[in-house]
Interface confidence: low
């Protein structure tokens, strides 16, 4: 069956790294420079991705695979296949239209990317603050005072149901 199909379509014989050249009687021609074909039987080669500006080349383009980009120092990748480079900030900061800004009081960011998120509210889980939060670190919750007093139940009641906070990045 495969052989019959290849007789009907000579292009199916062209391997990755080549294209079926209609201008040359459907001969398999190598992909031109800066182009590739990752599968066989293709009638054109795709243009290689160029890693320019804030993008830098992580993997060079070959005749059978596209180039892969990452970001120059001070930037980080976002999106599938590093479709975006976003400026790094320091821990304790977030990126805004005006550049990197310190997290407001009551919020933190422990990464070089993303947004400042509110400190955990320990009291919602019936706990107390063991270690105070900073711009770079969340608070650390400890056992509630009631848990430490004699005669307290060892069964912790479930936390009240609440909508998880969104912090898209």
């Amino acid at each position: 069956f495969e052989r019959t199909r290849s007789l009907q379509d000579p292009c199916s014989n062209c391997p990755a790294g080549t294209f079926c050249d209609n201008n040359r009687n459907q001969i398999c021609s190598p992909c031109p420079p800066n182009s590739f074909s990752s599968a066989g039987g293709q009638r054109t080669c795709d243009i290689c991705r160029q890693c320019k500006g804030v993008f830098r080349t992580r993997k060079e383009c070959s005749s059978t695979s596209n180039a892969e980009c990452d970001c120059t120092p001070g930037f980080h990748c976002l999106g599938a296949g590093c479709s975006m480079c976003e400026q790094d900030c320091k821990q304790g900061q977030e990126l805004t239209k005006k550049g990197c800004k310190d997290c407001c009081f009551g919020t933190f960011n422990d990464q070089k990317r993303g947004i400042c998120r509110p400190w955990t509210n320990c009291s919602l889980d019936g706990k107390s603050v063991l270690v105070n939060g900073t711009k770079e670190r969340d608070v650390v919750c400890g056992p509630s005072p009631a848990d430490l007093s004699p005669g307290a139940s060892s069964v912790t009641p479930p936390a009240p149901a609440r909508e998880p906070g969104h912090s898209p990045q």
């Epitope: 975006m84 480079c85 976003e86 990126l95 805004t96 239209k97």
Partner: antibody, heavy 122, light 111 residues
Framework: EVQLLESGGGLVQPGGSLRLSCAAS????????MSWVRQAPGKGLEWVSG????????GYADSVKGRFTISRDNSKNTLYLQMNSLRAEDTAVYYC???????????????WGQGTLVTVSS | QSVLTQPPSASGTPGQRVTISCTGS?????????VNWYQQLPGTAPKLLIY???NRPSGVPDRFSGSKSGTSASLAISGLRSEDEADYYC???????????FGGGTKLTVL
């Protein structure tokens, strides 16, 4: 009055290149994020690329990644889109728009330019 | 295929109320990203109609309202008028794609 005016569209052969420009006026261009959005004839809207106020954050749709390059010149209040290796499916009206980004959960486009038509055909 | 799903068409008679839906997923609307709506009159550029789920820019009549719940959003137009005949698009941000995404658009016909 806030205004955006695109230029640079036209007829180009497959594999060719074009550079679109968008001249901004009536607002502080240098502190606003900007985007390009396109609309193929009779089709819907597709976000193409976006750039932050200082070019520190740049993004592309998968369909144009590696072929298109967005840039801006804040001293000239102008946004650019360099389009290489053009394909028939890139035929569309290209709009530039101010991207009102509220980092975290919201971004919207307002205002929009009138658009410039790019036709890729042999 | 658009990342956000809208009905291709909707219709109503003058004075009626019509609703246009926009359905997304856990990487866009469901992730907490806001939804915005645009009106595109024939032969013109899109115009912002609703931003941040329910806010109206100045100059947009209060006949237009927006809402969002879970992974979907809606645009409602009350007291339908002939000049409302246009294409309507929803838009949000997608964390998986790291970019803005649009619905396929809904053509509103005023009968």
């Amino acid at each position: 009055e806030v205004q955006l005016l695109e230029s640079g569209g036209g007829l180009v052969q497959p594999g060719g290149s074009l550079r679109l420009s968008c001249a901004a006026s009536g607002f502080t261009f240098s502190s606003n994020e900007m985007s390009w959005v396109r609309q193929a004839p009779g089709k819907g809207l597709e976000w193409v690329s976006g750039i932050s106020w200082n070019s520190g954050s740049i993004g592309y749709a998968d369909s144009v990644k590696g072929r298109f390059t967005i840039s801006r010149d804040n001293s000239k209040n102008t946004l650019y889109l360099q389009m290489n290796s053009l394909r028939a499916e890139d035929t569309a009206v290209y709009y530039c728009a101010r991207d009102r980004m509220v980092r975290g959960v919201s971004n919207w486009f307002d205002p929009w330019g009138q658009g410039t038509l790019v036709t890729v055909s042999s | 295929q658009s990342v956000l799903t809208q009905p291709p068409s909707a219709s109503g008679t003058p004075g009626q109320r019509v609703t246009i839906s926009c359905t997304g997923s856990s990487s866009n609307i469901g992730a907490g990203y806001d939804v915005n709506w645009y009106q595109q009159l024939p032969g013109t550029a899109p115009k912002l109609l609703i931003y941040g789920n329910f806010n109206r820019p100045s100059g947009v009549p209060d006949r237009f309202s927006g809402s969002k719940s879970g992974t979907s959003a809606s645009l409602a137009i009350s007291g339908l008028r002939s000049e409302d005949e246009a294409d309507y698009y929803c838009q949000s941000y997608d964390s998986r794609l790291s970019g803005s995404v649009f619905g396929g658009g809904t053509k509103l016909t005023v009968l």
